[in-house]
């Protein structure tokens, strides 16, 4: 239609509820339904402050659709002030909802079962391990490989060899520090790798093992005896 | 040598406060969280807070909430408990405890370091 | 918060013979990481408590093989197998797998 329209809110009932008290691990949807013509776009504050994907652990989702954000896993440090803004050039519309994290017992860190996962690939290859880790306090990750020394996985000491690929630092985010990836892969990059979430309360951890095949092309080249060649 | 020595304790009178400090030696104190522990005379050992290796989270026990704060000063190697508000049942021998570190251990993570602990009395 | 339960309250064993320390947690101490976070502890007259077993069965360094530890995710056991008479003390369970950490009310060990 030709009818232009600054943004409107479609369904006030959805959004009376201003003050949501939910319980740590939770998951929280906030709905701000609207229509306007052309159709209004919508952004999400927090705390006055764009609100970024690398501003929490796990991200968020928004669903434009629904005009809703979603945050899975809620923590304390997700308390506050959360203002959708809905616009168009012919008008912006907002609206502020206050989250309050009800918190748990702190617990040591919690990783997602069965992640990282067993992989395999060959040579040449790329693979990547993914870590979900759950922690009331904001976590430390790390992904740690077990490597060896003058053939050995164990020093003198019978602690094992290993080697910090990856770290949250200033400059990498939560949800980067949950994949590890190997590019272009080699013999010398197969065994076992950990992921490693610790918090004021302790440390977990989770291994998973990389196996290296040889490339398709190249494994006559390896394994053949010069009996079979021609 | 790995050593935490706790001092700062004493005699107080209720309502009063008291600054504990706790000085860590011989490993990477801007590494690990520490904790307090206490226990009163001829009784068992009870937690009573904990702060993250940076500083950036402090979790208490219900029994200290809003009277004590941990804190931390990684450049001098020190672990804090300011107590406010002290009353008779506070009274115990407070200890320092170093708790999880930042990275892989092969052994216990944490709560294996204690120090010798510092005596406080809270007494009118 | 997690409640820990310790029998029993006292202990007198003879010099050689074993001696067992039981523990009961209000809530599974087993991890999603597959470890099970009960510390055992012995403290002795006028000193800080001393690490014995971590993770359940783990032997803290240094600490005799004659100390074990064994259960699973809400009893726990501390066994001793032979005792002497430096094993004089309180001995203490500990849940470290939330806050607030909690202790046992402790088991005092004497020689008779």
């Known amino acids: 239609s030709n009818n232009k329209r600054a943004p409107y809110w479609t369904n006030t009932e959805k959004m009376e509820k201003r003050l949501h008290a939910v319980p740590a691990a939770n998951t929280v949807k906030f709905r701000c339904p609207a229509g306007g013509n052309p159709m209004p776009t919508m952004r999400w504050l927090k705390n006055g402050k764009e609100f970024k994907q690398e501003h929490r652990i796990g991200g968020y989702k928004v669903r434009n659709q629904h005009w809703s954000l979603i945050m899975e896993s809620v923590v304390p440090s997700d308390k506050g002030n959360y203002t959708c803004v809905v616009e168009n050039e012919y008008g912006s519309i907002n609206h502020t909802y206050h989250l309050d994290v009800v918190e748990r017992s702190p617990h040591r860190p919690i990783l997602q079962a069965g992640l990282p996962a067993n992989a395999s690939t060959v040579v040449g290859g790329d693979v990547e391990f993914v870590c979900k880790v759950y922690s009331d306090a904001q976590p430390h990750i790390q992904w740690i490989k077990h490597v060896e020394k003058n053939g050995s996985k164990y020093g003198p000491d019978g602690l094992p060899y290993l080697k910090v690929l990856k770290a949250a630092g200033v400059n990498t985010t939560d949800k980067e520090i949950e994949v590890l990836y190997i590019r272009n892969v080699t013999f010398e990059d197969a065994g076992e790798y950990t992921c490693l979430a610790g918090n004021s309360i302790g440390i977990s951890f989770h291994s998973a093992w990389l196996t290296v095949l040889p490339a398709p092309g190249r494994e006559k080249e390896i394994t053949a005896s010069p009996d079979y060649l021609e | 040598e790995v050593q935490l020595v706790e001092s700062g304790g004493g005699v107080v009178q209720p309502g009063r406060s008291l600054r504990l400090s706790c000085a860590a030696s011989?490993?990477?104190?801007?590494?690990?969280?520490m904790h307090w522990v206490r226990q009163a005379p001829g009784k068992g050992l009870e937690w009573v807070a904990v702060?993250?290796?940076?500083?950036?989270?402090?979790y208490y026990a219900d029994s200290v909430k809003g009277r004590f704060t941990i804190s931390r000063d990684n450049s001098k190697n020190t672990l804090y408990l300011q107590m406010n508000s002290l009353r008779a049942e506070d009274t115990a021998i407070y200890y320092c405890?170093?708790?999880?570190?930042?990275?892989?251990?092969?052994?216990?993570?944490?709560?294996?370091?204690w120090g010798q602990g510092t005596m406080v009395t809270v007494s009118s | 918060d997690i409640v820990m339960t310790q029998t029993p309250l006292s202990l007198s064993v003879t010099p050689g013979q074993p001696a067992s320390i039981s523990c009961t947690s209000s809530?599974?101490?087993?991890?999603?990481?597959?470890?099970?976070?009960v510390y055992w502890y012995v403290q002795k007259s006028g000193q800080p408590p001393q690490l014995l077993i971590y993770?359940?069965?783990n032997r803290f360094s240094g600490v005799p093989d004659r100390f074990s530890g064994s259960g699973s995710r809400t009893d726990f056991t501390l066994k001793i197998s032979r005792v002497e008479a430096e094993d004089v003390g309180v001995y203490y369970c500990?849940?470290?797998?939330?806050?607030?950490?909690?202790f046992g009310g402790g088991t005092k060990v004497e020689i008779k």
């Open positions: 405890v170093r708790g999880a570190g930042r990275g892989y251990t092969y052994g216990p993570d944490g709560f294996d370091i």
């Open positions: 011989g490993f990477t104190f801007s590494s690990y969280a």
């Open positions: 702060i993250s290796y940076d500083g950036s989270n402090k």
């Open positions: 809530r599974s101490l087993l991890h999603s990481d597959g470890k099970t976070y």
């Open positions: 993770e359940l069965s």
């Open positions: 500990m849940q470290y797998i939330e806050a607030p950490l909690t």
